[in-house]
Interface confidence: low
C-alpha cells in the first residue's frame, strides 16, 4: 500500500508568492511559493495519486504583514481552502497568547491540529479541550493512518503560551500516544511536529512504532540529487534513521516559507512496515501557475493590508536616528529602540531566580536603513518601519559562549571608520572600545546585564559562560562577517518578524523617546 505525504513547515505568513530568498515578490516571473501556487501543485498530485495526505509541521504564524493584520484568521482560511489533513502546533502559534491561537485558528480550522506533549491545566483545560488533539486517525483510501503531533518543549522561552500550558519532553509524551494508536490497530503512524531536525531524528530513533517523522522548526532542507535553488541540503531526502529496534525510519522537512512542497512516497507492507521511501521537495517556482480562484481570494484579503501600512502605530517625540552616519559609527537611538523592542518581545514568564531568560541584544548597524523624523507629527507607521527594516528578517534567540561574544565585538570594530555594516548596536550590554589598539584587541570593557538576579545590573562578561542573546537572523547566519556566531552558536531558535517586533513595542509604549545613553563608549 502506497502513501503520498505532502508536507510544509515554517511557512511564516508567506501567503503570497515571494522572491527566491522568501522576501517580497518583486518580479513575478521569478517568484516562488504562495498558497495559490501550492494549491495548484497539491491538486495536481491529488488527481494523479490515490492516497495523499497534506500535512503542516507548524509555524504558519508570524512573518509578514499578513499575520500582523489578520492574526491567524488568514492561516485558518487558506489552510481550509487547501484542504490540509492535519497540522502540528509550532512555537509561533502561541505568539499572540493562547487566545490568539484558540479564536482565529483552533476554532476555525476544519482539520485536526495536533500536539501530544502540550498539556493544559487550570481553567484553560476545559476551555481548550478538544480544540487540539494529541493524535488523529485519518482514513486514507481503504486504510487508516495515525498522525501524532509534537511541539518544541522550548516554546515557553520562544513564545507566549502562558502559565496554563505545560510543554513536556517530546519523546516521553509521544510514546504512550503511539502505544495507544497501536492498541487501536493503527499500524501506520506519522509523527508530525515542530521541534527541529535533531529532535526529529531522536523521535525516529527512540519512539517505538513511529514509521515516518515529518518535522519543522529548524528550516532544514533535505534533497537527493542536485538541489534546484539556493538552499544547500543538510542531508538526503528522506533522511533515514535506524531506530533502536532496528527499523529504517524516514525523516523529512521541507525548508521553510512555502518555497517547497515536501513530497514523500512511502510503501507499506500489509503489517504496516515501511518497505520503501523516496521523494524530494518540489520547488514551487513560476513554472507552476498560481490557482486563479485562490489567487483571487488572496487579492481580496490583501485589501485590508494596504490600509494597515499607513495607520499610526504610535508616536515619537524625538528624532529616531537611523542614519548610517550614526548607526555604523557610534551608539544610535534607533539601534537602542530596536534592541529594547527585541528584549521586550522576549519577556517570558520567569521563575524566582531569573527576572527574564534573556537580557542581551546585538544588532548590526548596517541593518538599520533609515531614520524616522519626529517632525511629521511624530507619527510612526508600518511603512516607516519598513524603510528602517526592509529586509523581512527575524529577531532570533541564540545561545553563545562569552568568548564568542567577545570575538563578535572585536569584529564590530575591526575596520572601524569605513561606514561598514558590522558595527554593533546593543541592548543589555555596555562596551568600551579603544581604537588606538590593533584590530582584534580593541574591546577594553564588556559588561552584560545579569538575568539571574532580582535587580538587573551589569557584570563583566565571562568567557566560559553561556549567554542567551537576541539578534537578527542575518547575524545568526554569519552575515556581515560574523562567521564566529554561525560557527560557534550552541542553539538557534528563529523568532518574530523584525518589523512586527518593533511595531508591537511602539504600539505598546504609545509614545517613545529613546536616548543615546552610553551603551557604547570609546576610550
Amino acid at each position: 500500500w502506497e502513501l503520498t505525504i505532502l508536507h510544509t513547515n515554517d511557512v511564516h505568513s508567506r501567503l503570497e508568492q515571494t522572491s527566491e530568498d522568501s522576501s517580497k515578490c518583486v518580479n513575478a516571473s521569478r517568484c516562488m511559493g504562495g498558497v495559490a501556487r501550492l494549491f495548484t501543485k497539491v491538486q495536481q498530485i491529488r488527481r494523479a495519486e490515490p492516497n495523499v495526505l497534506l500535512l503542516d509541521a507548524g509555524d504558519q504564524y508570524q512573518g509578514t504583514i499578513w499575520f500582523t493584520v489578520y492574526k491567524g484568521a488568514e492561516v485558518a482560511h487558506f489552510m481550509n481552502a487547501l484542504r490540509y489533513d492535519a497540522m502540528a502546533l509550532g512555537n509561533h502559534e502561541f505568539d499572540n497568547g493562547v487566545e490568539g491561537l484558540i479564536e482565529p485558528l483552533l476554532k476555525e480550522a476544519k482539520f485536526p491540529i495536533l500536539s501530544a506533549n502540550i498539556k493544559a491545566k487550570g481553567p484553560l483545560a476545559s476551555q481548550i479541550s478538544g480544540l487540539y488533539l494529541p493524535y488523529k486517525v485519518l482514513p486514507v483510501g481503504d486504510e487508516v493512518v495515525g498522525i501524532v503531533g509534537y511541539t518544541s518543549k522550548e516554546t515557553p522561552f520562544l513564545s507566549n503560551p502562558g502559565t496554563n500550558l505545560v510543554f513536556e519532553d517530546e519523546i516521553t509524551a509521544l510514546q504512550p500516544e503511539v502505544d495507544k494508536l497501536k492498541t487501536l490497530n493503527v499500524n501506520k503512524i506519522i509523527a508530525l511536529g515542530h521541534s527541529g531536525f535533531e529532535t526529529d531524528k531522536l523521535i525516529a530513533q527512540k519512539v517505538r512504532g513511529v514509521d515516518v517523522v515529518v518535522g519543522g522548526h529548524s528550516n532544514t532542507f533535505l534533497y537527493t540529487g542536485n538541489p534546484p535553488s539556493k538552499e544547500v541540503p543538510a542531508g538526503k531526502y528522506p533522511f533515514i534513521v535506524t531506530s533502536d529496534d532496528g527499523r529504517k525510519v524516514p525523516v523529512v522537512q521541507a525548508y521553510a516559507f512555502g518555497k517547497y512542497l515536501g513530497y514523500l512516497k512511502i510503501e507499506f507492507d500489509e503489517r504496516g512496515n515501511v518497505i520503501s521511501s523516496h521523494g524530494n521537495p518540489i520547488l514551487l517556482n513560476s513554472s507552476i501557475p498560481e490557482d486563479p480562484s485562490i489567487k483571487a481570494d488572496i487579492n481580496k484579503w490583501r485589501i485590508k493590508l494596504d490600509n494597515y501600512s499607513t495607520q499610526e502605530l504610535g508616536k515619537t517625540i524625538v528624532y529616531l536616528d537611523g542614519s548610517s552616519q550614526s548607526c555604523r559609527f557610534r551608539e544610535c537611538n534607533m539601534g537602542n529602540l530596536i534592541c529594547d523592542a527585541m528584549i521586550n518581545n522576549n519577556l517570558r514568564h520567569a521563575d524566582e531566580m531569573f527576572w527574564n531568560h534573556v537580557s542581551m541584544c546585538i544588532l548590526n548597524g548596517g541593518g538599520i536603513r533609515s531614520p524616522i523624523d519626529e517632525r511629521n507629527n511624530g507619527t510612526i507607521t508600518w511603512e516607516n518601519l519598513a524603510a528602517v527594516l526592509p529586509f523581512g528578517g527575524t529577531f532570533d534567540l541564540v545561545q553563545l559562549k562569552g568568548s564568542t561574544l567577545k570575538k563578535a565585538f572585536e569584529h564590530s570594530v575591526h575596520r572601524y571608520g569605513q561606514s561598514t555594516g558590522e558595527f554593533l548596536q546593543v541592548g543589555g550590554i555596555h562596551v568600551v572600545y579603544d581604537l588606538s589598539r590593533k584590530p582584534g584587541d580593541r574591546v577594553v570593557k564588556l559588561d552584560v546585564l545579569c538575568t539571574k538576579c532580582r535587580v538587573p545590573s551589569y557584570d563583566p562578561l565571562k568567557m566560559d559562560e553561556i549567554y542567551k542573546v537576541i539578534l537578527p537572523n542575518f547575524l545568526a547566519n554569519g552575515g556581515d562577517g560574523f562567521q564566529m556566531i554561525k560557527d560557534e552558536l550552541l542553539r538557534h531558535d528563529s523568532g518574530d518578524q523584525d518589523i512586527n517586533v518593533v511595531s508591537t513595542y511602539i504600539s505598546k509604549m504609545k509614545v517613545i523617546y529613546p536616548a543615546v545613553e552610553g551603551r557604547i563608549k570609546f576610550s
Partner: antibody, heavy 122, light 111 residues
Amino acid sequence: QVQLVQSGAEVEKPGASVKVSCKASGYTFTSYWITWVRQAPGQGLEWMGDIYPGSGNTNYNEKFKTRVTITADKSTSTAYMELSSLRSEDTAVYYCAKEGGLTTEDYALDYWGQGTLVTVSS
Amino acid sequence: EIVLTQSPATLSLSPGERATLSCRASKNVSTSGYSYMHWYQQKPGQAPRLLIYLASNLESGIPPRFSGSGYGTDFTLTINNIESEDAAYYFCQHSRELPFTFGQGTKVEIK
C-alpha cells in the same frame, strides 16, 4: 476614480537633468507599481523602469540605468522620474502608468498619466 | 531582452471589416497557462489605453469587439466589426522578464 496627473512640459539644455512628477489619486498608491515609459516623436513606446511605492523597490531598463532615478513620495502619493545627462535624443513624451493587479501578477498598465513633453535643445 | 515584432506596419480597412494584428516575441512569454502579453491603443496626442491583458482578458470598459489570443511567441489582436473610432496605433507589450518591451506598433486606418 484613478488618476495620474503629470507635471508640465520642460525644455532643457544638453547635459542638464529633468525631474518629472506623477501625482496619483483614487487608489492605494503604495500597493501598485508605477512604471515610466517614454515615446520619442513619431516613435514607439520604451519601458524605462518602475517603482513599488510601498517598499521603494525599483527596476530599471539597462539602457537608462546609469542616468535614470525613479523615486516615490508616499506622503503625497507622487512618483518621480529623474533623467540626467540629457541629450537631444531624449526629446520625448514621458508617461507614468499604474500597473494592474494587487500583487505583481500581470504588470499590464491599466492607467496612464497624460504625458510630459521634455524637449532637449541648446 | 525580448524583441516584439508587430505586423503589418499599417492596416487600412473599411468600417465593419475585421482587423487582425500580429505580435511575435523573440522568446516564449507564456508559462503554464499564463501569457504575459498585453495590448494597448493610442490615438494621436493621447496616452495609450489598455485593451487586453494577459493575452486574452478584456480590460473593463473596452468594447467586446476587441479580443486577444495566442500563447508562447505568437499573439493576435482582433477587432471585429471595426468602427471609425478604432483608427489608432496599437502596441503589444510583454511582462515576462525585465526589461519589459513594446512592439513598434501597427497603425490602423479606416477608409
